[in-house]
């Protein structure tokens, strides 16, 4: 018995508006109905917690209302967005999924996904 | 799946010693680092030490004091606590996490990255 596998991709490009979005998949062993997602971030050997949701599996992922982060989910798979990113915030960003019910309790982690954020360059003023 | 129960717990004096003890069952311990944390009365749950299969780490205020170490052939992992002052009276509880390429010895001990939580186990120093 392993610890339950997560996979998300190595490398993300925010967009110029500070968004990121990325895949996040776990291998259930079981058939849970309650699952719940969090998002950590490592960087500089500091880590945080990024956001987190409990979601009954069908049903719409909801964070909180300050959240930074979005989220679908369709079976063992979650698409997460994070909004707001800086160019401070690149990091490595790692998907946690806890299967919390029915038990038996799972723990899985990925290997994480590296979000660089580039801040957009100000727009020059125009002589017209 | 891992089932984690911890025990060892109890009074001590200041100065004197205890051993935890934190034992596994329903998978190997090898794809796991294992931490034990402790929370005081009115306080956050602090790291603090954890243990993989090549590294261990501490907390600043336990170092030189207690020892981690594991029996992976058992499913066992150990806390060995010497020179217990008072403030090291807290519920301590052991938890695991799966070994990740991108711990360092600076995180891989973060509370962030566990589950498999035990009940806890009560530590007290007192004369």
């Known amino acids: 018995c392993k610890a339950m596998h997560v996979a998300q991709p190595a490398v993300v490009l925010a967009s110029s508006r500070g968004i990121a979005s990325f895949v996040c998949e776990y291998a259930s062993p079981g058939k849970a109905t309650e699952v719940r997602v969090t998002v950590l971030r490592q960087a500089d050997s500091q880590v945080t917690e990024v956001c987190a949701a409990t979601y009954m599996m069908g049903n719409e992922l909801t964070f909180l209302d300050d959240s930074i982060c979005t989220g679908t989910s369709s079976g063992n798979q979650v698409n997460l967005t994070i909004q707001g990113l800086r160019a401070m915030d690149t990091g490595l960003y790692i998907c946690k999924v806890e299967l919390m019910y029915p038990p038996p309790y799972y723990l899985g982690i990925g290997n994480g996904t590296q979000i660089y954020v580039i801040d957009p360059e100000p727009c020059p003023d125009s002589d017209f | 799946e891992v089932q984690l129960v911890e025990s060892g717990g109890g009074l001590v004096q200041p100065g004197g010693s205890l051993r935890l003890s934190c034992a596994a069952s329903g998978s190997t311990l090898d794809p796991f680092v294992i931490g034990w944390f402790r929370q005081a009365p009115g306080k956050e749950r602090e790291t603090v030490s954890c243990i993989n299969r090549s590294r261990t780490s501490y907390a600043d205020s336990v170092k030189g004091r207690f020892t981690i170490s594991r029996d992976n052939s058992k499913n066992m992992v150990y806390l060995q606590m010497n020179s217990l002052r008072a403030e090291d009276t807290a519920v301590y509880y052991c938890?695991?996490?799966?070994?990740?390429?991108?711990?360092?010895?600076?995180?891989?001990?973060?509370?962030?990255?566990?589950?498999?939580w035990t009940q806890g186990t009560q530590v007290t120093v007192s004369s």
């Open positions: 938890a695991a996490s799966p070994d990740k390429p991108f711990y360092t010895d600076q995180t891989m001990c973060n509370k962030h990255y566990y589950g498999y």
